[in-house]
């Protein structure tokens, strides 16, 4: 089921629009995968929710206090004029925790982007031509990363001279799409909170 299309306010916190697009795109891609890979465990009941960002980023830990901490007086002393080059935090003084949260979201997106691009390169070589990643989803990830635009070194796509294991790639695709959808929900909630505050 497609999520309703939101028409953002021109003055809206810019990343909210991108996060809504991301959630919609990953939900659509997941629906497509479930339909196409019907002989693979690809439904939320079947799948294991494995997180590739585990022990590498701390998005939930960093972003949860933003919602829980209504009174940010404890953070005010650590307030920093940390401003990213992108539009999400432009001309705002942000709390240390908010900066940490958005930085962690950026790192999550970067990790998933590398995985998805690598998998898509393999899927494009599949003689069965069964499934490919939605270019719109990859574009939306890129847009949100650009809007966040933390000065981070670009991670090269994992190139491989090995013959692709198409079966493994499809199993992994289902697992990562489910995990990424959960992360996209978290990102959207964070952006909604920041837009409202």
């Amino acid at each position: 089921r497609n999520l309703p299309v939101a028409t953002p306010d021109p003055g809206m916190f810019p990343c909210l629009h991108h996060s809504q697009n991301l959630l919609r795109a990953v939900s659509n891609m997941l629906q497509k995968a479930r339909q196409t890979l019907e002989f693979y465990p690809c439904t939320s009941e079947e799948i294991d929710h494995e997180d590739i960002t585990k022990d590498k980023t701390s998005t939930v830990e960093a972003c949860l206090p933003l919602e829980l901490t209504k009174n940010e007086s404890c953070l005010n002393s650590r307030e920093t004029s940390f401003i990213t080059n992108g539009s999400c935090l432009a001309s705002r003084k942000t709390s240390f925790m908010m900066a940490l949260c958005l930085s962690s979201i950026y790192e999550d997106l970067k990790m998933y982007q590398v995985e998805f691009k690598t998998m898509n390169a393999k899927l494009l070589m599949d003689p069965k031509r069964q499934i490919f990643l939605d270019q719109n989803m990859l574009a939306v990830i890129d847009e949100l990363m650009q809007a966040l635009n933390f000065n981070s070194e670009t991670v090269p796509q994992k190139s491989s001279l090995e013959e692709p294991d198409f079966y493994k790639t499809k199993i992994k695709l289902c697992i990562l799409l489910h995990a990424f959808r959960i992360r996209a929900v978290t990102i959207d909630r964070v952006m909604s909170y920041l837009n409202a505050s």
Partner: nanobody, 114 residues
């Protein structure tokens, strides 16, 4: 600390059967989709069967209908039942996770020959 230990391999005639167990440490096993892989000399490791923590399975086309993967969550063990073995199934068999692979075990050699 050894985290993945495969066993049960051996020499078997075409048409024969083998059952391979793999014991994994709890952190690798719990809540993760596990898979059996195989590798022949000069070729890369390929996934042949996978099983989710809830027991949902799937198989590579080359082994479908002949191999069965199962797991015992209480024993942190994943099994590969191999029936109607063919010479082309000769390989070293390994188990591991699917998404974030752990350090590989030693594997177990399966040779199908008359």
């Amino acid at each position: 600390e050894v985290q993945l230990v495969e066993s049960g391999g051996g020499l078997v005639q075409p048409g024969g059967s083998l059952r391979l167990p793999c014991v994994a440490s709890g952190s690798i096993f719990r809540g993760n989709t596990m898979g059996w892989y195989r590798q022949t000399p000069g070729k890369q490791r390929e996934l042949v069967a996978s099983i989710t923590s809830r027991g949902y399975t799937s198989y590579a086309d080359s082994v479908k209908g002949r191999f069965t993967i199962s797991r015992d969550n209480a024993k942190n063990t994943v099994y590969l039942q191999m029936n109607s073995l063919k010479p082309e199934d000769t390989a070293v068999y390994y188990c591991n996770r699917i998404v974030v692979e752990s350090q590989w075990g030693q594997g177990t050699q399966v040779t199908v020959s008359s």
